[in-house]
Structure formats: C-alpha cells, structure tokens
Interface confidence: medium
C-alpha cells in the first residue's frame, strides 16, 4: 500500500527572465527514492537517478540547473514556460508518486509565490 | 566503483545447459532505468549482445538465440543470471555482463554497457 | 536487425600519427527523441571492451581526449589522434537504436 504523500511548491509566479526552484518532497513512506523525473507537459526535463546522478534533457541543458537537493532550477524564463510541471518520484517498493506545480511566468515585476498544497 | 564479475561452469558438454552468473557492485537492479546486459565474444571473433534484465523486470533477448535463453536475476544479492539451453561447440565463448540503463530513458546514452565484467571462458566439448 | 559494417578490418599506425576508422549502419540510428544511438568500444588485448565514445562524439569517464567522434545518421567516424602504444587493440561501433543490439566486426589497430 502506498502511504506516502509530495508535498510541492504549489502554484508559483516568477519574472520573465528570471530563475525560479521546482521543489517537491516525499514523505510519510519509507520507500527508497530510486529516482526523480522533472517533466513538463509531455516533455522529460531532467532525471535525477539514485545510482547514475543528474541528467538534464539536451533541449534543456541550457536553461535548467539540478538542485537544490532533488528540485530542479528554471533559469532564463520565458511567458512560453508558463505551465504545470510534475515531479515524479520512482520508488521502491511502493512504486510512482506524483507531484504537480503550476508555474506562472509574468511581464510584471510583481511575482507572488502561492502556498504550498499537497498530493497524496 | 562499479564492477562485475562474471562466473560459470568453464567446461560443459553439447546439450548441456549453460548456466552464468553476474555478481555486481556499486550499483542495484532496483533502481529505475538499470540493468544488466550479457554479450559475448566467440574465440576470436567479434561482440554478440544475448539479453538484457531491467530493475522492473522486464527482459530484452536477442531473437536469434531467444528460445534458448533465460535471463533472470537477485536483486537482493546483487546478481543477474544467463541460461543457454541445448549447448553446442558454437557456444565456445567468452560471456561478459556488463551494467546498462536503458536506451530513451537515459538518452545520451552514457551508461550503455558503460562498464563490462573481465568475462567468463566458456567451453563447449564433447 | 541493424546492420554495422566497419572499415578497415585492420590499420596500423606509427606512433604519434592519426588513425581513423569508419563505421556505417543499415538504418539511420538517430532516434525521435533527437539523440542517435551509436557508441564506439576499445577492447584491448585480453582486456574485456571498454565504453570510449556514446552519442556519436561524447568522451566517456576517464577516456582520453585524443579520442574523438563524428558522423550522422548511417556514417561515423572514430579519430585516434597522437596514437599510443596503449591505444593498440580492436575497436567496435554499436548500435542501441533497437534490440538486437548490433556491433561492427571490430578494427584491429597496431602500431608500425
């Protein structure tokens, strides 16, 4: 049975051109953590992997940075990278886990960040 | 440090069942993506890949062979496990593991057979 | 199956000079996904293969930089640059566009 729940960053804003920290968190299961996939819409970003380390997708290398920890870092932002974004935890032996974060990129220089809100 | 090592009967006879055995280190089949790939090298002659076992089980045979092998594994014990039914002298080869991750998930492809064992001579002799 | 057809069968190389060797597969190994598919592996004498180059041009861990790649598509090229007495052994292409996994027949590279 899977008892554990993400906790992530919720629903965040950022400035255009600026750099915003996708993080998501596991807990309440002892499962280990045998990797993490960052993907937007359909697209991978980076893979943070228990045994291999981090790879960041080529069409992405440039503009996103791994870490902290297992979040991943969006840099140079653009309105088109306003969206949801996933973190999805692979864990043994409960299995997938799924978080979810809605990124708002603005013009303004006004960015609130949302609260934090959890997924079981 | 990864590493692989590689082990089996030396000699059989035509057959036979051919039975090896990976034990490995540095890394574990129940991390997503991995696995453990067998290749071998007939005396002489170039690299033929037989099989791959994924962390989530699932296998990948090399059609020309796939009704003669099984590969299995022990995640626990870290070993992976290659059988070669029906042995013939053809079979007379060098069996190497090497550690894999698996194609499109690991896509520049830096951790395909990435590093092998230092392999097991087979010999197949009546 | 994938065919890889490698050239030459042999080359031999005074030391310090450049070797080159050639390999071409049946089937386009560039994946959807942008990435294709074929590494170069050194196996040197009685020593199991080891992973030189992936993707085509990528240096794998603790791999000379003498060692370099190209190529698109069917055709590849593996360029051994200032050639060593430790760079003697057969080199194999491969494909992991799909299973079968397929290698070139190997260059055997010697020294003048």
């Known amino acids: 049975m899977m008892t554990g729940t993400i906790e992530t960053t919720g629903n965040i804003s950022a400035e255009k051109g600026g750099s915003i920290i996708l993080q998501c968190h596991l807990s309440s299961t002892t499962a280990q953590v045998t990797q993490v996939n960052w993907e937007q819409q359909d697209q991978l970003l980076a893979i943070c992997n228990a045994d291999l380390g981090w790879h960041i997708s080529p069409s992405f290398k440039d503009r996103v940075a791994p870490g902290p920890g297992l979040g991943l870092t969006l840099q140079s932002l653009t309105v088109n990278d306003t969206g949801e974004y996933f973190c999805i935890y692979h864990t043994y032996p409960d299995g997938t886990y799924t978080g979810r974060i809605f990124l708002e990129v603005l013009e303004s220089s006004v960015a609130e960040h949302g609260a934090r809100f959890q997924i079981p | 440090q990864v590493t692989l090592k590689e082990s089996g009967p030396g000699i059989l006879q035509p057959s036979q069942t051919l039975s090896l055995t990976c034990t490995f280190s540095?890394?574990?089949?129940?991390?997503?993506?991995?696995?453990v790939g067998w290749i071998r090298q007939l005396s002489g002659k170039g690299l033929e890949w037989l099989a791959n076992?994924?962390?989530?089980?699932?296998?990948y045979y090399n059609p020309s062979l796939k009704n003669r092998l099984t590969i299995s594994k022990d995640t626990s014990n870290n070993q992976a496990f290659l059988k070669i039914t029906n042995v013939d002298t053809a079979d007379t080869a060098t069996y190497y593991c090497?550690?894999?991750?698996?194609?499109?998930?690991?896509?520049?492809?830096?951790?395909?057979?990435?590093?092998w064992g230092q392999g097991a001579s087979v010999t197949v002799s009546s | 199956d994938i065919m890889m057809t490698q050239s030459p069968l042999s080359v031999a190389v005074t030391p310090g000079e450049s070797a080159s060797i050639s390999c071409r597969s049946s089937?386009?190994?560039?994946?959807?996904?942008?990435?294709?598919?074929l590494s170069w592996y050194l196996q040197r004498p009685e020593k199991s293969p080891q992973l030189l180059i992936f993707q085509i041009s990528n240096l794998a861990s603790g791999v000379s930089d003498r060692f370099s790649g190209s190529g698109s598509g069917t055709d590849f090229t593996l360029i051994i640059s200032k050639v060593e007495t430790e760079d003697v052994g057969i080199y194999y292409c491969m494909q992991f566009l799909e299973v079968p996994y397929t290698f070139g027949a190997g260059t055997k590279l010697e020294l003048k």
């Open positions: 089937k386009s190994l560039l994946h959807s996904n942008g990435i294709t598919y």
């Open positions: 090497a550690r894999i991750a698996r194609p499109h998930y690991y896509w520049d492809g830096r951790y395909i057979l990435d590093v």
């Open positions: 076992i994924w962390w989530d089980d699932d296998e």
């Open positions: 540095g890394f574990s089949l129940r991390t997503y993506g991995l696995g």
